[in-house]
C-alpha cells in the first residue's frame, strides 16, 4: 500500500507521476548491486550486462516523469518502500539506501536535497 507522503510542494502530483512509471528496473538494478557485494553471493557479477541493462531501463523510466527532478525523492521513497521487507539485515538496508541515493547521479540527474528514505514506519 502506498503511504502518505509528507513533503513540501505538490506531492500529490508527484505521487501520480511515480504511480505511472515502472520502478521495477530500478529495484532490480539496486538489488543486483547489493547482491554483488554480499560474500555469500560471490557468483553475482555486478558489472554484468543484466545489471547495466537494468540501470539504463531504470534511468529511462525515471526520465518518463514530467517533473523528474522535482519528483525524484518520491520515486526513491517508493523504491525503498517496495523493497523494505526483502531486506532482513540492518547493514543491507543501509547499503540499499546508499545505492538508492546514488541512483540520480547514475542517471545524470541532480540528487534531491533532503530526501528522507525512512519510509516504513521504523521497519526499514
Amino acid at each position: 500500500m502506498r503511504r502518505e507522503r509528507g513533503r513540501q510542494g505538490d506531492s500529490s502530483s508527484c505521487e501520480r507521476q511515480v504511480d505511472r512509471v515502472n520502478l521495477k528496473p530500478c529495484e532490480q538494478h539496486i538489488m543486483q548491486r547489493i547482491m554483488g557485494e554480499q560474500e555469500q553471493y560471490d557468483s553475482y557479477d555486478i558489472r554484468s550486462t543484466r545489471s547495466s541493462d537494468q540501470q539504463q531501463r531504470c534511468c529511462d523510466e525515471l526520465n518518463e516523469m514530467e517533473n523528474t527532478q522535482r519528483c525524484m525523492c518520491e520515486a526513491l521513497q517508493q523504491i525503498m518502500e517496495n523493497q523494505c521487507d526483502r531486506l532482513q539485515d540492518r547493514q543491507m538496508v543501509q547499503q540499499f539506501k546508499r545505492e538508492l541515493m546514488n541512483l540520480p547521479q547514475q542517471c545524470n540527474f541532480r540528487a534531491p536535497q533532503r530526501c528522507d528514505l525512512d519510509v516504513s514506519g521504523g521497519r526499514c
Epitope: 517496495n82 526483502r86 540492518r90
Partner: antibody, heavy 118, light 111 residues
Amino acid sequence: EVQLVESGGGLVQPGRSLRLSCAASGFTFDDYTMHWVRQAPGKGLEWVSSIRWNSGNLDYADSVKGRFTISRDNARHSLYLQMNSLRAEDTALYYCVKDNGLRTLDFWGQGTLVTVSS
Amino acid sequence: DIVMTQSPLSLPVTPGEPASISCRSSQSLLHRNGYNYLDWYLQKPGQSPQLLISLASNRASGVPDRFSGSGSGTDFTLKISRVEAEDVGVYYCMQALQTWTFGQGTKVELK
C-alpha cells in the same frame, strides 16, 4: 563461528505457558532478523515467528497468532518465544534460526523440545 | 497463504546416479526485484536442517557443486548430479515471498 543455543523446553500441561530462549554468538546479533521454526515429532518443518533486528516487525504463523510472542534483547544477544495457552499440537522441537539478510534461514540451532501433555 | 508441494515424497537413490526433487508453489515466487524467493534445505538424520540453495539457484557456502537449483515462478527443481551416501536425509523447499512456508519434505534414502 555462528552458534545458536536454545533452552527452556520441557513438559507442560495444556493451557499453561512456557518461555523459550536462544543465546546467539559468532555474529552481530543486532543486525539480523531472527526466527523460530518448529518440527513436530516425525513431521516436517513449520515456520513459527520472526522478529526484525530492531523489533520493528513481528510476524507469526496463523497457528500461533495471539498465543505466542516473539521478542529479543540485543544487549544480551538473546531471542525469546513466550508461548501461552499451549495445546497438544504445539508439541515439537523448536529451532532458533538466523536470517542471512535476504529472507533465507542460514544458521540453525540444535533445538529445544516442548511437550504439551496432561 | 502460499502452499508448497514437493514430489516425490520418497526417493530411493543409487550412489553415483543423479536425483531430482520438484517443488511447486501455489503462486509465483518471483518478486518484482527479479529474484525467486525459494530456498532448499537438507535435514540429515538426527541433525538440524542446513541451507543448500537460496533464491532458487544460489549454492550456499560449503555446499558441494553436485547440488544445483533451478526454476522460476511456481516450478522449481533441486538436482543432485551424482548422489553420495552422505546426501541421505529429508529435503525441504521453502518459500520466503510472504512470511515463510515449507514443503512437506522429500525423504532421500539409499536403495
